[in-house]
């Protein structure tokens, strides 16, 4: 029961996480107008990984976006870039983790099959969150830079600025979002290896030993499957012996007299 | 058809004070912000004040800040603005204006402005 | 707060000449986040409420006519009637939409020669 929580709560804070990193992405304020010490401005300026906005204060916003490639500095474009490669990894984990999950049961998937998709979104969750704080770490690191520059302005060398000293940026709401859903992402993989532990099944040091069933042919092995035949009510593979501990939502069952020869 | 009426002007002594009003009509006065701003007898224009839609922020000029309070109601279409110790100075035509929607925070539309005159 | 200095105080000319007026703001009025100049130009006949003709440095308000124009970027700006007309002797006002609190020029008065 344990590995099964640990695994649908790993899945569910990384769905979140990854969301969050989606939401971050998109979301315009990841550099805010600094207000502190700054003259009233009649407007307030916040930029996006993709585009920069301005609200005036009759409340009408104007964005515009980057059309640009080559103008953008190399720091930008990493950032984009580890972004989005932070989505993908989460998006095709959550793929993954949905058919490791213990609870779905998919044909006869075998528990060795589902705990190494487990491992595996694990994996790709921790490398997702990874990448959002990275993303986010190094946009934060180059508005710190950027701060005290006189131009105010942080994408230098997209055309004649005029010197000003009315605009500075700080650290926006996305990047707030960003480390925590890259954190969120982080704790689900890490749940998610955690229960990959669990769901393995669990190596034994003595050989297996065939018992052959009055009935029909059934090996047990430990730490193996019952083997089916197809017929009866033994079509969903059930573990009925794993020489070890077993999960309270396991079925349990045991060889009775009549298996025996 | 955008009309801004102002009201409340008229003749005070020095030390005194004055509630002027705008009415406003034609357009949907709660969506926009409202300035106040001043003209002394053949001199220039001078902002006083700003309040926006929902009315916060508001700003004034520094040099009226603690004597001159801007307020508005949304429910009556009306912007306010509260004089209080009046000085000789304060003698001008006071406009009240509309803050336009896109139009880089230009101010769209004017009323006819109301006389306020300070002597003793 | 910023200071808007206009120029000429006062220009007398005749109907149909080419009118410039200057404003200089203390400050850049270019914002760097939407690369927009904010400053408006105001005309004021005696007697009436000032009518906003340019908002953005360059963008005419609707319903003003093409003979007004304006121009320039940052700290310098220029008011420009190319042909001008018997109703266009007024003042002219420049004010910064930028900074509170929005300063206006002292106003340039076109008269009539």
């Known amino acids: 029961m344990a590995v099964t929580a640990c695994q649908g709560l790993g899945f569910v804070v990384s769905l979140i996480g990854i969301a969050g990193i989606i939401a971050a992405t998109c979301m315009d304020q990841w550099s805010t107008q600094d207000l502190y010490n700054n003259p009233v401005t009649a407007v307030f300026n916040y930029q996006g990984l993709w585009r920069s906005c301005v609200r005036e204060s009759s409340g009408f916003t104007e964005c515009r976006g980057y059309f640009t490639l080559l103008g953008l500095p190399a720091m930008l474009q990493a950032v984009r870039a580890l972004m989005i490669v932070g989505i993908v990894l989460g998006a095709i984990g959550l793929l993954v983790s949905i058919f490791a999950l213990k609870c779905i049961r998919i044909g006869s998937m075998e528990d060795s099959a589902k705990a190494n998709m487990t491992l595996t979104s694990g994996i790709m969750f921790i490398v997702s969150g990874l990448c959002a704080i990275a993303g986010v770490s190094v946009f934060a690191n180059m508005l710190v830079t950027n701060f005290w520059m006189s131009t105010a302005n942080m994408y230098t060398g997209m055309g004649g600025m005029v010197q000003t000293v009315q605009t500075r940026y700080t650290f926006g709401a996305a990047l707030f979002v960003g480390w925590v859903a890259g954190g969120l992402t982080l704790i689900g993989g890490v749940m998610m290896c955690i229960a990959c532990r669990g769901l393995a099944p669990e190596e034994t040091n003595y050989k297996a030993v065939s018992y052959h069933a009055s009935g029909h042919s059934v090996a047990y092995k430990p730490g193996g499957f019952k083997a089916s035949t197809g017929f009866g009510s033994n079509t969903k593979n059930k573990k009925i012996y794993d020489g070890g501990a077993r999960t309270e939502d396991e079925v349990q069952s045991y060889p009775s007299k009549h298996d025996y020869v | 058809e955008v009309q801004l009426v102002e009201s409340g002007g008229g003749l005070v002594q020095p030390g005194g004070s004055l509630r002027l009003s705008c009415a406003a009509s034609?357009?949907?006065?709660?969506?926009?912000?409202m300035h106040w701003v001043r003209q002394a007898p053949g001199k220039g224009l001078e902002w006083v004040s700003y309040?926006?839609?929902?009315?916060?922020?508001?700003y004034y000029v520094d040099k009226l800040k603690g004597r001159f309070t801007i307020s508005r109601d949304n429910a009556k279409n009306s912007l306010y603005l509260q004089m209080n110790s009046l000085r000789a100075e304060d003698t001008a035509v006071y406009y009240c204006?509309?803050?336009?929607?896109?139009?880089?925070?230009?101010?769209?539309?004017w009323g006819q402005g109301t006389l306020v005159t300070v002597s003793s | 707060e910023i200071v808007m200095t206009q120029s000429p105080p006062t220009l007398s000319l005749s109907p149909g000449e080419r009118v410039t007026l200057s404003c200089k703001s203390s400050?850049?009025?270019?914002?760097?986040?939407?690369?927009?100049?904010?400053l408006a130009w105001y005309q004021q006949k005696p007697g009436q409420a000032p009518r906003l003709l340019i908002y953005?440095?360059?963008t005419r308000e609707s319903g003003i006519p093409a003979r007004f124009s304006g121009s320039g970027s940052g700290t310098d700006f220029t008011l420009t009637i190319s042909s001008l007309q018997p109703e266009d002797f007024a003042v002219y006002y420049c004010?910064?939409?930028?900074?509170?609190?929005?300063?206006f020029g002292g106003g340039t008065k076109v008269e009539i020669k």
């Open positions: 034609g357009f949907t006065f709660s969506s926009f912000g």
């Open positions: 004010q910064n939409d930028l900074f509170y609190p929005l300063t």
């Open positions: 309040i926006s839609s929902g009315s916060s922020p508001i």
């Open positions: 400050q850049s009025l270019l914002n760097v986040g939407n690369q927009k100049n904010y």
């Open positions: 204006a509309r803050a336009g929607y896109a139009v880089r925070n230009a101010l769209d539309y």
């Open positions: 953005g440095a360059s």
